[in-house]
């Protein structure tokens, strides 16, 4: 739902002898590269499953939808889109499962119109904090991107750098202030344990959050307060075990907004009490009727939405001296 | 590609009902807020309300509550805005649009009703 | 329901003019205000969201802001595809109202 779509339209493909061609010529009107598939018509290049190591040099300058997916370009270098005359039309490019490693500062800059941008199945070790912002200056020019789609980026545990990950990812998001336009932001499926406190003040333009298939156990340190637009808030096959008040409240208060909490290993002790209340008379929550326990065992499946204050209960803490080890 | 597709032009008689429709495509329809603006002849644009697929959820501008009935059959990713009984003022041009911002728009279906 | 109240409601401008066009809420709406184009007989076009940020594929010669309840946009030098009416709309409370247009006419 993501990725860049294109109509049905005639695709032209270059011919294979091409392959090792590279024109250093700006590319005529009608000129498709090799192992790529273009329909003018339909403003669209598919370059998907052809093992390419670098981005074609001679894209047409037409190209509206760009698909790169499928192949090995391991590094995306600065200016990686840069050409002369630039690609003025591009607005979406999807670069899914491309092995991507590295993508540096500047990789997607002179693209003004780059609407959507999809890196998901990228094993990210090296992200760059200005692979968006396109410069270290503490505000940069706004980027164009409405769509920053970033599922399952993240690199298998050996090679992942020496620092965080999550603040690897929210460093890019952050820099220079590039992103405040930024509508819709998707980071599923990426290990993540919390949520940088900073990362959602500073996109207030937000609408469509998905976070889904991490391993969040608490929005505890996360403000909602500022994302006055959201609409979509994606915490599906999540850790988290309940939700306090003032995220409740928080969440009550945005007008437009629908939640996904399903599949999540809720904890249905004294502390879920204000949770359960909120689900009984919120509509925010889609699928709230699905939502079970998780623990303790002998609440494991109930439904929340049935339960009452008598259900919901923590056992008596001993005092220290009389617990046992 | 994301693309709101409304229906055809309709002209109709004071009494009658109608049902337009807008099918939404290239994006997760569920997902998105759809509204709907009606553009009397030579004038400006007026809110008339919007509903969330997902759930059916619909707002609705108090000068439109109870004239219109706003839904979404979400199986066909389609949204639809309906009048139980036309009046000669429903004359004009209807527009859907995607989000509680307005970033697609179908291309309108003008509603005609005279006697 | 919240009020916006353009200004002016036309406005003749030749190409290469700086143009500005007002909004004014009857109360505060915080950063919940677009602006759209709208051509005759065809669909509005979102121009400026969130009061200042720039829908993509449009160009930069626009641009928008403001605070509280009163909002302005800019074309910096007009082109001969700007002669066009201009809506301002808030979606801070609901029903999520237009202002009356501008028509931006050729002098």
């Known amino acids: 739902s993501s990725s860049p779509t294109s109509s049905a339209s005639s695709f032209s493909s270059s011919a294979p002898f091409l392959a090792s061609a590279v024109s250093a010529q700006p590319p005529l009107p009608d000129q498709c590269p090799a192992l790529c598939e273009c329909s003018e018509a339909a403003r669209t290049v598919k370059c998907v499953n052809r093992n390419l190591t670098e981005v074609p040099t001679d894209l047409p300058a037409y190209v509206r939808n760009l698909f790169l997916t499928g192949n090995q370009l391991a590094v995306l270098p600065a200016g990686a889109f840069a050409r002369r005359p630039p690609l003025a039309e591009l607005a979406a490019l999807n670069l899914s499962g491309s092995r991507l490693d590295e993508v540096r500062a500047g990789a997607f800059e002179h693209l003004p119109s780059l609407r959507q941008l999809d890196l998901s199945h990228n094993p990210l070790a090296d992200l760059s904090p200005f692979a968006f912002s396109g410069s270290n200056a503490s505000v940069s020019a706004p980027s164009p991107l409405v769509e920053l789609i970033l599922n399952h980026i993240v690199p298998p545990e050996d090679e992942r750098q020496n620092r965080s990950f999550e603040g690897m990812v929210v460093a890019a998001l952050l820099a220079g202030r590039a992103l405040q336009g930024l509508r819709r932001l998707e980071l599923a499926s990426n290990h993540f344990l919390y949520l940088p406190r900073d990362v959602l003040a500073q996109l207030p333009s937000l609408r469509h959050l998905d976070l889904s298939n991490n391993s969040l156990v608490s929005l505890t340190y996360v403000s909602f307060r500022n994302l006055t637009h959201l609409e979509s808030l994606h915490l599906e096959d999540n850790a988290l075990k309940v939700l306090h008040n003032g995220t409740l409240a928080e969440l009550q208060g945005l007008p437009h907004i629908r939640v996904f909490l399903d599949n999540n290993p809720w904890v249905c002790d004294c502390h879920m009490a204000d949770m359960v209340t909120w689900l009984k008379e919120t509509e925010v929550v889609q699928g709230k009727d699905r939502l079970t326990c998780a623990y303790p065992e002998k609440m494991r499946n109930r439904v929340l939405l049935e339960l009452n204050s008598a259900d919901l209960d923590c056992d008596p803490i001993l005092p220290p001296s009389l617990q046992t080890s | 590609e994301v693309q709101l597709v409304q229906s055809g032009a309709e002209v109709k008689k004071p009494g009658e009902s109608l049902k337009i429709s807008c099918k939404g495509s290239g994006y997760r329809f569920t997902s998105y807020w759809i509204g709907w603006v009606r553009q009397m002849p030579g004038k400006g644009l007026e809110w008339m309300g919007i509903?969330?697929?997902?759930?059916?959820?619909?707002r609705y501008s108090p000068s439109f509550q109870g004239q219109v009935t706003i839904s979404a059959d979400k199986s066909i990713s389609t949204a639809y805005l309906q009048w139980s009984s036309l009046k000669a003022s429903d004359t004009g041009m209807y527009y859907c649009?995607?989000?509680?911002?307005?970033?697609?728009w179908g291309q309108g279906t003008l509603v005609t009703v005279s006697s | 329901a919240i009020q916006l109240t353009q200004s002016p409601s036309s406005l003749s401008a030749s190409v290469g003019d700086r143009v500005t066009i007002t909004c004014r809420a009857s109360?505060?709406?915080?950063?919940?205000l677009a602006w759209y184009q709208q051509k005759p007989g065809k669909a509005p076009k979102l121009l400026i969201y969130d009061v200042s940020n720039l829908e993509s594929g449009v160009p930069s010669r626009f641009s928008g802001s403001g605070s509280g309840t009163d909002f302005t946009l800019t074309i910096s030098s007009l082109q001969p595809e700007d002669f066009a009416t201009y809506y301002c709309?808030?979606?801070?409370?609901?029903?999520?109202?237009f202002g009356q247009g501008t028509k931006l006419e050729i002098k």
């Open positions: 109360q505060g709406i915080s950063s919940a």
């Open positions: 509903i969330y697929p997902g759930d059916s959820d619909a």
């Open positions: 649009a995607r989000s509680v911002l307005f970033d697609y």
């Open positions: 709309q808030q979606f801070n409370s609901y029903p999520h109202t």
